[in-house]
Interface confidence: medium
C-alpha cells in the first residue's frame, strides 16, 4: 500500500468505516456485500469470498484496514492498466466503432511495451477475434488482458 498518498489513505479509512458496519475493525464477506450492493454491484457470495481470500494476509477470513489498503491499491493499479490498454486501442480505432483490425492489434501490443513473439500475438488474435472476421472487439480484448 506504499504507493498510496496520505489523502488516499484517509479517504479509504473513511470508506473502510462504511464497510465496517459493526465497527469491529474488520470487514466480513457480509459487510463487503452490503456496501457493494449499495454501490449498484451484485457480487455472488463466491465472488465476495474470492475478493477477501486474495488479500486476507493472515487467513482469518476477514479483512482488516491494512489488508483493505492492499485491496484498494491493487484495484487502482488494475484500473490504470485497463485505462492504458483502452488508450492504446483508441489510437488505432479511427472511427470509434470499438473494433480494430487484427493487424493493428500487433501495434497496440507494441505500444503497451509488451515484447510478444509473433506466435503469442497470433494466439491472442485467435482468442480476441471471436467471429473470425479479422476485427478485434476491444472491450473483449481489454477484459482478456486485465482478467476481469
Amino acid at each position: 500500500a506504499d504507493q498510496l498518498t496520505e489523502e488516499q489513505i484517509a479517504e479509504f479509512k473513511e470508506a473502510f468505516s462504511l464497510f465496517d458496519k459493526d465497527g469491529d475493525g474488520t470487514i466480513t464477506t457480509k459487510e463487503l456485500g452490503t456496501v457493494m450492493r449499495s454501490l449498484g454491484q451484485n457480487p455472488t457470495e463466491a465472488e465476495l469470498q474470492d475478493m477477501i481470500n486474495e488479500v486476507d494476509a493472515d487467513g482469518n477470513g476477514t479483512i482488516d484496514f491494512p489488508e483493505f489498503l492492499t485491496m484498494m491499491a491493487r484495484k487502482m493499479k488494475d484500473t490504470d492498466s485497463e485505462e492504458e490498454i483502452r488508450e492504446a486501442f483508441r489510437v488505432f480505432d479511427k472511427d470509434g466503432n470499438g473494433y480494430i483490425s487484427a493487424a493493428e492489434l500487433r501495434h497496440v501490443m507494441t505500444n503497451l511495451g509488451e515484447k510478444l513473439t509473433d506466435e503469442e500475438v497470433d494466439e491472442m488474435i485467435r482468442e480476441a477475434d471471436i467471429d473470425g472476421d479479422g476485427q478485434v472487439n476491444y472491450e473483449e480484448f481489454v477484459q482478456m488482458m486485465t482478467a476481469k
Partner: nanobody, 121 residues
Framework: QVQLQESGGGSVQAGGSLRLSCVAS????????MAWFRQVPGKEREFVGR????????MYADSVKGRFDISRDNAKNTVFLQMSSLKPEDTAVYYC??????????????WGQGTQVTVSS
C-alpha cells in the same frame, strides 16, 4: 484463488538436466497463462519463460533459450520446466506464476513458494 506448488528441484552437475513441475489447484487451470521465474539471493526475480493458457505459444529469456523448455498438461493442472545443459549460473530458487490471461504479461496474479535448483561445476 489459485494455489501453486513447485517440485522437482535439487542438485545436479553442470551439463545435467532437471524437470520442474508446478501443480495448480483452486481454479480452472486452462484459464491461466503460466510462467517460470527464478531468483538468486540478493538479486531481483528474473523471468525465465512463459506459456500461453492453451499451451500454443511459449517465450523464453535469452539466457535459457535452446536449453529450457516449458510445457503444460491442462488435464493434470500442471506446467513443466525441462532444464537441460544446466550451468552453475542457473542456480536459483525457481518459481512458477499464473495470471488469468491468454499470455502472462505484467505482474502475475499468483506465485508458488519456489523450489531450489543448485548446479555445481
Amino acid at each position: 484463488q489459485v494455489q501453486l506448488q513447485e517440485s522437482g528441484g535439487g542438485s545436479v552437475q553442470a551439463g545435467g538436466s532437471l524437470r520442474l513441475s508446478c501443480v495448480a489447484s483452486g481454479r480452472t487451470f486452462s484459464s491461466y497463462a503460466m510462467a517460470w521465474f527464478r531468483q538468486v539471493p540478493g538479486k531481483e526475480r528474473e523471468f525465465v519463460g512463459r506459456i500461453s493458457r492453451s499451451g500454443g505459444s511459449t517465450m523464453y529469456a535469452d539466457s535459457v533459450k535452446g536449453r529450457f523448455d516449458i510445457s503444460r498438461d491442462n488435464a493434470k493442472n500442471t506446467v513443466f520446466l525441462q532444464m537441460s545443459s544446466l550451468k552453475p549460473e542457473d542456480t536459483a530458487v525457481y518459481y512458477c506464476a499464473a495470471k488469468a490471461a491468454v499470455i502472462l504479461t505484467g505482474i502475475p496474479d499468483y506465485w508458488g513458494q519456489g523450489t531450489q535448483v543448485t548446479v555445481s561445476s
